[in-house]
């Protein structure tokens, strides 16, 4: 069929923040490289119908469906979506190909469906069909990677059962401690599933997909390192694989390693050994202990012993269900206005938690740091000395945890005053919560020393700022004080602050604010 034009269908993914409905356009935005949708002739269809590969789009993503037509002469076109006709403006590119585009900004459920493009050229008419659906991210998962021994080889395979298929990488480091941070030059990354070099100091495997990145560290006991002051502890859930690596370096090959669970040697098939010579001709041996699917009775002390090094143990605890252990009692803090202070939560959890710090309905990123004793700690220092309620929330696959903190900032009261026809009110948010006095200013008392005790009502109330208390004092108007100046004073251990109010007619009439330290 010589008359058929050569057409190409492409998908362009955009990085944009505009908000609009689907529209036909000849002006694509900043974009990533086009993806060929391989338009193929649809067999057994009446007329000439090309069908593009199905397009899956994330919610809120922006895309362009584009058709490139290599046919002589002018073309005209029409887009049809859900029985509605959409305007179509073809243009020609530098290679003189006809270009027709449909831009979909901020993909929503209503924009999913079949997009039909009718093209009329001087030679022939044809239809192109695009099917656009929203990617079901509810089905997305990102699971922590785990290890398996490669069949008949001394190598580890890293597996992460995630959707979409994750990119798996090994993160290797041969230094100690801080220098093994992700950005460090000591860190080497290998984007592959199988790892043969298993002698390194620190070995992690990471999996990443659209949902983020999850890593698992190969639990290691190094017999040449001074043992931790607390026993290393490893938690696993029933059914998960257990991998512990024991590593030892000696001046020559004349030493051996063994693994024991409690007092009993691990059974054949639950360990394998590898050895190599290092650059300085010392011998490195590693002995892996592994259980492909742990049960409750795999709990216990796993001890790696050597004929030339002191033995070291790790406590492996198998749990039915994940957990988060921490004290959830609320904590109150009071600090000075310029005092350095951080909230902190110490917890033990398995699997690793995801967490947030929240203040005044705003969430802040949460960082966690592992401690030597098997606990982790999360600190929050970014409170900017704002008093109120702070919330730490943590969760993993099996558990949730919330802890409340109240931050009070010690400061001298600041007084705001307002008056109405029947009463005068003063407000203060100093901390500790202030006490109030009311004084009448008159000829007899020009310094406002005559105290008013009748008709005064004090209360504390919650203000809009989350969890922050404000104290108020209200003076009910009486004939005895109408027309006079009155002074309300708020005082606490850090000082006193006053406002003077004229009690004659409605409306706020605060005059002078006196700050008396």
């Amino acid at each position: 069929n010589q008359d058929l034009p050569v057409i190409k269908c492409v998908l362009i993914n955009h990085k944009n923040n505009d908000s609009s409905v689907g529209k036909s356009s000849s002006y694509p935005m900043v974009s990533e490289s086009p993806e060929d949708l391989g338009c193929a002739l649809r067999p057994q269809s009446s007329g000439t119908v090309y069908e593009a590969a199905a397009v899956e789009v994330d919610v809120s993503a922006s895309i362009t469906l584009q058709v490139l037509v290599d046919a002589p002469g002018n073309i005209s076109c029409l887009w049809v979506f859900k029985h509605s006709s959409l305007n179509c403006q073809p243009h020609f590119d530098l290679q003189n190909r006809g270009v027709v585009s449909m831009v979909i900004l901020k993909m929503t459920e209503t924009q999913a469906g079949e997009y039909l493009l009718f093209i009329q050229s001087e030679a022939t008419n044809y239809t192109i069909l695009f099917t656009v659906s929203i990617r079901n991210t509810l089905l997305y998962t990102l699971r922590r990677p785990y290890f398996r021994k490669m069949e008949n080889q001394d190598a580890l395979v890293c597996i992460s059962e995630s959707v979409p298929e994750p990119i798996v990488e090994w993160v290797l480091c041969d230094s100690q401690g801080e220098s093994c941070k992700e950005e460090s030059p000591a860190v080497v990354k290998k984007e592959e599933k199988v790892l043969h070099e298993l002698f390194g100091t620190d070995i992690r495997c990471c999996a990443r997909n659209e949902l983020g990145r999850e890593c698992t560290r190969l639990f290691t006991i190094d017999l040449n390192q001074t043992p931790q002051t607390t026993l290393p502890q490893l938690f696993l859930k029933v059914g998960e694989p257990l991998w512990i690596r024991c590593k030892a370096v000696h001046v020559n090959h004349g030493f051996g390693l063994t693994w024991e669970l409690e007092n009993k040697a691990l059974e054949e098939g639950n360990y394998f050994e590898m050895s190599t010579y290092s650059t300085n001709r010392t011998m490195i041996r590693i002995l892996f202990a592994f259980v492909s699917s742990v049960a409750r009775n795999d709990t216990g002390y796993y001890t790696c012993s050597s004929s030339k090094h002191p033995s070291q143990s790790a406590l492996v605890t198998i749990v039915e269900k994940g957990f988060i252990n921490a004290t959830n009692s609320s904590e109150d803090y009071e600090i000075d206005q310029y005092e350095e202070f951080c909230f902190s939560v110490r917890f033990k959890a398995y699997p690793q938690i995801r967490c947030t710090w929240t203040f005044s309905r705003k969430s802040f990123p949460c960082e966690q740091k592992g401690l030597d004793n098997g606990y982790s700690i999360s600190k929050f220092c970014n409170h900017k000395h704002q008093p109120g309620e702070y919330i730490f929330h943590a969760e993993n696959d099996d558990a949730q945890f919330t802890k409340m903190f109240t931050l009070n900032i010690r400061r001298k009261p600041q007084v705001l005053a307002e008056a109405s026809a029947s009463q005068a009110s003063c407000f203060s948010d100093g901390y500790p919560l202030p006490s109030w006095t009311w004084k009448k200013c008159s000829d007899k008392s020009p310094n406002c020393t005559e105290e008013i005790t009748e008709g005064v009502w004090n209360r504390k109330a919650n203000r809009k700022v989350f969890g922050q208390w404000v104290s108020s004092s209200t003076l009910n108007m009486s004939e005895a004080i109408k027309g006079f100046l009155v002074k309300c004073c708020a005082y606490n251990s850090l000082g006193t602050s006053c406002e003077t109010i004229l009690l004659n007619s409605p409306g706020p009439f605060p005059f002078i604010q006196d700050n008396i330290s």
Epitope: P227, T258, S311
Partner: antibody, heavy 116, light 107 residues
Framework: EVQLVESGGGLVQPGGSLRLSCAAS????????MSWVRQAPGKGLEWVAS???????YYPDSVKGRFTISRDNSKNTLYLQMNSLRAEDTAVYYC??????????WGQGTLVTVSS | DIQMTQSPSSLSASVGDRVTITCKAS??????VAWYQQKPGKAPKLLIY???YRYTGVPSRFSGSGSGADFTFTISSLQPEDIATYYC?????????FGGGTKVEIK
């Protein structure tokens, strides 16, 4: 049923030697760490030596260089060779299964008396 | 070496009483602590391992708790057959060390 039976105890002069044996039954002897623990008359327990399934040996400083622990897996037997014995080595010597962590089974003990 | 300090060294209690023995390690030993019972003229018997786990066949009146450096052994309701000396032991590191023992008698 796990059974540990010690033998070889007796009276020995200071500076002398003695070899204790422990016959084990009722479990896979070769798979387990084994130990010797002693108890001086009227006193508490003191760990003396351990050997794990791989044959690696461990001693406290008080006996290092004088005592040697060994095992014969084909005979299901644990040994303690004691040389240069001193009066303070006088004790009941117990053979115990374990030592990598806890001691889960104990024999009835054999008395070693070091005296001139 | 890690020292295990047991207290009291002896105690006297009535049948049915709750008995508590403490053991203090000279450094953090995590939960790597065991408790043994030794009756007069007999070999010791393992009662509790990993600080709080009862060994097979041990009656439920015996329990253990603690982590770090402070450990407690409890007999919830003392029975006549519980007359014995009780020892704690750490297996956090070599050498394995025992407490000095607590002799439990019946009033």
């Amino acid at each position: 049923e796990v059974q540990l039976v010690e033998s070889g105890g007796g009276l020995v002069q200071p500076g002398g030697s003695l070899r204790l044996s422990c016959a084990a039954s009722g479990f896979t002897f070769s798979s387990y760490a084994m130990s010797w623990v002693r108890q001086a008359p009227g006193k508490g327990l003191e760990w003396v030596a351990s050997i794990n399934s791989g044959g690696f040996t461990y001693y406290p400083d008080s006996v290092k260089g004088r005592f040697t622990i060994s095992r014969d897996n084909s005979k299901n037997t644990l040994y303690l060779q004691m040389n240069s014995l001193r009066a303070e080595d006088t004790a009941v010597y117990y053979c115990a299964r374990g030592g990598t962590t806890v001691f889960d089974y104990w024999g009835q003990g054999t008395l070693v008396t070091v005296s001139s | 070496d890690i020292q295990m300090t047991q207290s009291p060294s002896s105690l006297s209690a009535s049948v049915g009483d709750r008995v508590t023995i403490t053991c203090k390690a000279s450094q953090d030993v995590s939960t790597a602590v065991a408790w043994y019972q030794q009756k007069p003229g007999k070999a010791p018997k393992l009662l509790i391992y990993s600080a709080s786990y009862r060994y097979t066949g041990v009656p439920s009146r015996f329990s253990g708790s603690g982590s770090g450096a402070d450990f407690t052994f409890t007999i919830s309701s003392l029975q006549p057959e519980d007359i014995a000396t009780y020892y704690c032991q750490q297996h956090f590191n070599t050498p394995r060390t025992f407490g000095g023992g607590t002799k439990v008698e019946i009033k």
